[in-house]
Amino acid sequence: MRRGPRSLRGRDAPAPTPCVPAECFDLLVRHCVACGLLRTPRPKPAGASSPAPRTALQPQESVGAGAGEAALPLPGLL
């Protein structure tokens, strides 16, 4: 089981993302998933306001939090 989410540093700017390393934010289901498990494009579910692009926020360089920490993050790079 994965530990808690970590703030991750992008290449261009110190923008945190919610996902642990090796996970991507899936813009369809709106939560973190294993990057290799991103599914093929399909229509956004009923009730959605607009079509979501079938892409993901990609983690770049990990910025590890404290060892053993399992808490959901407070974004520290705002």
Partner: antibody
Framework: QVTLKESGPGILKPSQTLSLTCSFS??????????VGWIRQPSGKGLEWLAH???????YYNSSLKSHLTISKDTSRNQVFLKITSVDTADTATYYC???FGYGLDYWGQGTTLTVSS | DIQMTQTTSSLSASLGDRVTISCSAS??????LNWYQQKPDGTVKLLIY???SLHSGVPSRFSGSGSGTDYSLTISSLEPEDIATYYC?????????FGGGTKLEIK
């Protein structure tokens, strides 16, 4: 420290429009992956997810209530809003706002109570 | 929509007891499940996220487990402050949904 606080009118008459505000601190809705949503709970009953808005302005609504709901945000003021048109007595409930950041809802407000009565 | 079912709506236990609360999903939710505690005053707090990860500040007597469609929350030794209603929540697919809640009382 992440905090959220809901505010609303307290009492409305049937057919009026409910306007709720969620004011938050400790995070920014401009952060990638961040979202804030609304959940309600009629007295003595369970939780019902109503609507959610994300940093990229994508919105999602409970399909059974979608025609009555509008969610919006003011990122610079750290606020999220929910409007429910044509309220009925069935909309009497405690309304919560809550944050999401990649793994479902994590931090919740204290709730604001709405009574719809003629 | 994914239906979340908590078959036990109320549960009575003694202080110090080990308590397990169950939740089942109408389809596989791949561990995308959280547990919340709602105190009698209405305050809602996250206890466990992603099936088994303990949220910040939550006592270690709380734990979560499960996979596929079946999940559980365990309190290893019941304390007076644990009197509350507990809800499961799936965020595998939109719309996100909740179980009906399990109200925990002291015998």
């Amino acid at each position: 420290q992440v905090t959220l606080k809901e505010s609303g009118p307290g009492i409305l008459k049937p057919s009026q429009t409910l306007s709720l505000t969620c004011s938050f601190s400790g995070f920014s809705l401009s952060t990638s992956g961040m979202g804030v949503g609304w959940i309600r709970q009629p007295s003595g009953k369970g939780l019902e997810w109503l609507a959610h808005i994300w940093w990229d302005d994508d919105k999602y609504y409970n399909s059974s209530l979608k025609s009555h709901l509008t969610i919006s945000k003011d990122t610079s003021r750290n606020q999220v809003f929910l409007k429910i048109t044509s309220v009925d007595t069935a909309d009497t409930a405690t309304y919560y706002c809550a944050r999401s950041f990649g793994y479902g809802l994590d931090y919740w407000g204290q709730g604001t109570t709405l009574t719809v009565s003629s | 929509d994914i239906q979340m079912t908590q078959t036990t709506s109320s549960l009575s236990a003694s202080l110090g007891d080990r308590v397990t609360i169950s939740c089942s999903a109408s389809q596989d939710i791949s561990n995308y499940l959280n547990w919340y505690q709602q105190k009698p005053d209405g305050t809602v707090k996250l206890l466990i996220y992603y099936t088994s990860s303990l949220h910040s500040g939550v006592p270690s007597r709380f734990s979560g487990s499960g996979s596929g469609t079946d999940y559980s929350l365990t309190i290893s030794s019941l304390e007076p402050e644990d009197i509350a209603t507990y809800y499961c929540h799936q965020f595998s697919e939109l719309p996100w949904t909740f179980g009906g809640g399990t109200k925990l009382e002291i015998k």
